[in-house]
């Protein structure tokens, strides 16, 4: 079948990085500069994407693959193939219709993008709050309140992250 197809359509023999040139008796011609074809049998090459302005080149265009862009510092990619760059906020904030706003009490965001999320409810796991939450950080849950009672007989030392005077990483 492949042989039959190629006899009927000489363009099917043109590999990625070339196009089937109708002006030159359907021979396979290399893609011109700043263009590419990512599949074989193409009758034209696609224009390379140019990463300009807020968009930075993450991967250069080649004869067989398009350029890939990301965003300049202060922005992050949105959309398929980084079609847009959304502005960052600070940790402890979220982007709303009115701009970057601090997380409400009881919520946090440890990234420069995304939304504020509620602090973990330690009591749901039968634990107590070891380190309070902030706008930038979730709470750290510790042992259950019963484990901390004066009569507790456990002699197992706490995990390093729970040592007094050390903040968890």
């Amino acid at each position: 079948f492949e042989r039959t197809r190629s006899l009927q359509d000489p363009c099917s023999n043109c590999p990625a990085g070339t196009f089937c040139d109708n002006n030159r008796n359907q021979i396979c011609s290399p893609c011109p500069p700043n263009s590419f074809s990512s599949a074989g049998g193409q009758r034209t090459c696609d224009i390379c994407r140019q990463c300009k302005g807020v968009f930075r080149t993450r991967k250069e265009c080649s004869s067989t693959s398009n350029a890939e862009c990301d965003c300049t510092p202060g922005f992050h990619c949105l959309g398929a193939g980084c079609s847009m760059c959304e502005q960052d906020c600070k940790q402890g904030q979220e982007l709303t219709k009115k701009g970057c706003k601090d997380c409400c009490f009881g919520t946090f965001n440890d990234q420069k993008r995304g939304i504020c999320r509620p602090w973990t409810n330690c009591s749901l796991d039968g634990k107590s709050v070891l380190v309070n939450g902030t706008k930038e950080r979730d709470v750290v849950c510790g042992p259950s309140p019963a484990d901390l009672s004066p009569g507790a007989s456990s002699v197992t030392p706490p995990a390093p992250a729970r040592e007094p005077g050390h903040s968890p990483q």
Epitope: G53, V54, F55, G74, F75, L78, S83, M84, C85, E86, Q87, L95, K97, K98, G99
Partner: nanobody, 124 residues
Framework: QVQLVESGGGLVQPGGSLRLSCSAS????????MSWVRQAPGKGLEWVSD????????FYEDSVKGRFTISRDNAKNTLYLQMNSLRAEDTAVYYC?????????????????WGQGTLVTVSS
């Protein structure tokens, strides 16, 4: 409804200056990035410059860097393009355009509203 109205174009000698304005209405101007795009006679659209919603981040096409300055006055809902050291190749219709999402800079294909354009002719 969204409206973008450019003004300030005209005939200027090489080396001269012009300041384009774009008056915006019908949306919360201060929440959207804005752009200038131009079209030279017989050519396609060419991106010129972007400015983010707050005005602190600006971006330029290489050929206009150091000569053009984009700015905005969110209190007046107005976008500007200060054009200095103008060259014959800057002759074009200049359009202002609005980006589609708040606090986001898009590619030119995704701009959702455009003005009617103002003609800039650089000639001696």
């Amino acid at each position: 409804q969204v409206q973008l109205v450019e003004s300030g174009g005209g005939l200027v000698q090489p080396g001269g200056s012009l300041r384009l304005s774009c008056s915006a209405s019908g949306f919360t101007f201060s929440s959207y990035a804005m752009s200038w795009v131009r079209q030279a006679p017989g050519k396609g659209l060419e991106w010129v410059s972007d400015i983010n919603s707050g005005g602190e981040s600006t971006f330029y096409e290489d050929s206009v860097k150091g000569r053009f300055t984009i700015s905005r006055d969110n209190a007046k809902n107005t976008l500007y393009l200060q054009m200095n050291s103008l060259r014959a190749e800057d002759t074009a219709v200049y359009y202002c355009a609005k980006h589609p999402l708040t606090f986001t800079i898009a590619t030119m294909n995704d701009y959702d509203y455009w003005g009617q354009g103002t003609l800039v002719t650089v000639s001696s």
